[in-house]
Interface confidence: low
């Protein structure tokens, strides 16, 4: 009796859904009464399926309402654990242990990515100095550097602060501000570069025409 896994590493994005799968040999009709399926992540119990029933009382609170064993897949010889709305805390090593005549187990690693995809940006003007203040803010994991560049490929020096997200403890809230004297229609880019990751996320900021009071416009 040997369990197989089609993948032993899953890399998914924060907030997405994932199905981890272990396969086991089934002859003809599956006998649910002798099948035992356990899914665990490190020391957290996720699924305990015994005598044809799942025991909801053993499930670790962090998986409540988000993790389920896909029962229809059992008849195909698949112990499929579906996790919805994946959190950063879900990252780790999962173990499926199956008894069905014999017993076996396999380990599967889940990695969770949180790219700085949604970048919020603002442009304001300091009325005293006439400097433009460009701000980019995004949430992700792990920490990110923010690189400011102009359309003529100049690298500029911004000020970046990193705080914890209010949405999820492990997410970082990264805000970067660039103060610069510039003119209308100039284009600037803020690029979030996650430490240890090749994929970058960039937002484009176009300096708008200066706002003129309509009354002043009529006097010109």
């Amino acid at each position: 009796f040997t369990i197989t896994v089609s993948k032993d590493l899953y890399v998914v994005e924060y907030g997405s859904n994932v199905t981890l799968e272990c396969r086991f040999p089934v002859d003809k009709q599956l006998n649910l009464l002798v099948l035992v399926v356990y899914w665990e992540m490190e020391d957290k119990k996720i699924i305990q399926f015994v005598n044809g029933k799942e025991d909801p009382n053993v499930q670790h609170s962090s998986y409540h309402g988000r993790a389920q064993l896909l029962k229809d897949q059992l008849f195909l010889g698949k112990a499929a654990l579906q996790i919805t709305d994946v959190k950063l805390q879900d990252a780790g090593v999962y173990c499926c242990l199956i008894s069905y005549g014999g017993a076996d187990y396999k380990r599967i690693t889940l990695k969770v990515n949180a790219p700085y995809r949604k970048i919020y940006h603002t442009i304001s003007v300091d009325p005293v100095t006439s400097e433009h203040e460009l701000t980019c803010q995004a949430e992700g994991y792990p920490e990110a550097d923010v690189i400011w560049t102009s359309s003529d490929h100049q690298v500029l020096s911004g000020k970046t602060s990193i705080t914890s997200s209010k949405r999820e403890e492990k997410l970082f809230n990264v805000t970067s501000t660039l103060r610069i004297n510039t003119t209308a229609d100039k284009i600037f880019y803020c690029t979030f570069r996650r430490l240890g990751h090749e994929e970058n996320n960039t937002a484009e900021l176009v300096i708008p025409e200066p706002y003129l009071d309509p009354a002043k416009k009529r006097n010109h």
Epitope: T2, T4, V5, S6, K7, D8, L9, V36, Y38, E40, E42, D43, V93, C95, L97, S99, A103, D104, Y105, R107, T109
Partner: antibody
Framework: QVQLQQSGAELVKPGSSVKISCKAS????????MHWVKQQPGNGLEWIGW????????KYNQKFDGKATLTADKSSSTAYMQLSSLTSEDSAVYFC???????????WGQGTLVTVSS | DIAITQSPSSVAVSVGETVTLSCKSS????????????LGWYQQKPGQTPKPLIY???NRHTGVPDRFTGSGSGTDFTLIISSVQAEDLADYYC?????????FGPGTKLELK
């Protein structure tokens, strides 16, 4: 840090049984598979089987089926191996080894020497 | 059962030399589903417990010096110890954990010249 402390050497008579222990500390005992390995002088290493302490599931090398019985006590974080109907062939050092995520025996006990002699 | 053979059974080296240990299995240890070879290398010094060096044929365990390098795939595997140190003198075992029962080779004894 992770430690596996095994019981001391045993001198036993042929035909009898012996139960050796392996006390784990420094990690969550219930969520790692505990393997047992036999080593005879000049005979290399032989895998006996594993136990999953959380549920008591076991898997044996067929060669040791009926010879070795693996159990675990969650409350004391201790794994046990009982060897029965002992013969001189069972004289060996027995190791417990805890498995990490990559199905590799990462943490080993110091070994228990079992000598079967009349 | 999968049979594992190791060669040489013993080898004598001088400190600073490079040594190559061989391990062969009677069937492929490559698991096609994830393209990993389920082979490990262990070091056992006299009177001590085995210490894991390499998993999945090529991955070093945490804290293992980079002079230990695992290579190979399928049925033929190699452990290279470059610039051998006195503390490397030990028995080296390879073992497979793809198919039950898990099996080990008879070992290679690394001795000082």
């Amino acid at each position: 840090q992770v430690q596996l402390q095994q019981s001391g050497a045993e001198l036993v008579k042929p035909g009898s049984s012996v139960k050796i222990s392996c006390k784990a500390s420094g990690y969550t005992f219930t969520s790692n598979f505990m393997h047992w390995v036999k080593q005879q002088p000049g005979n290399g290493l032989e895998w006996i089987g594993w136990i999953y302490p959380e549920y008591g599931n076991t898997k044996y090398n067929q060669k040791f089926d009926g010879k070795a019985t693996l159990t675990a006590d969650k409350s004391s974080s201790t794994a046990y191996m009982q060897l029965s109907s002992l013969t001189s062939e069972d004289s060996a050092v027995y190791f417990c080894a805890s498995e990490e995520a990559v199905i590799s025996l990462v943490y080993w006990g110091q070994g228990t020497l079992v000598t079967v002699s009349s | 059962d999968i049979a594992i053979t190791q060669s040489p059974s013993s080898v004598a080296v001088s400190v600073g030399e490079t040594v190559t240990l061989s391990c062969k299995s009677s069937q492929s240890l490559l698991y096609s589903e994830n393209q990993k070879d389920y082979l490990g290398w262990y070091q056992q010094k006299p009177g001590q417990t085995p210490k894991p060096l390499i998993y999945w044929a090529t991955n070093r365990h945490t804290g293992v010096p980079d002079r230990f390098t695992g290579s190979g795939s399928g049925t033929d595997f190699t452990l290279i110890i470059s610039s051998v140190q006195a503390e490397d003198l030990a028995d080296y075992y390879c073992g497979q954990y793809l198919v039950y029962p898990f099996t080990f080779g008879p070992g290679t004894k690394l001795e000082l010249k």
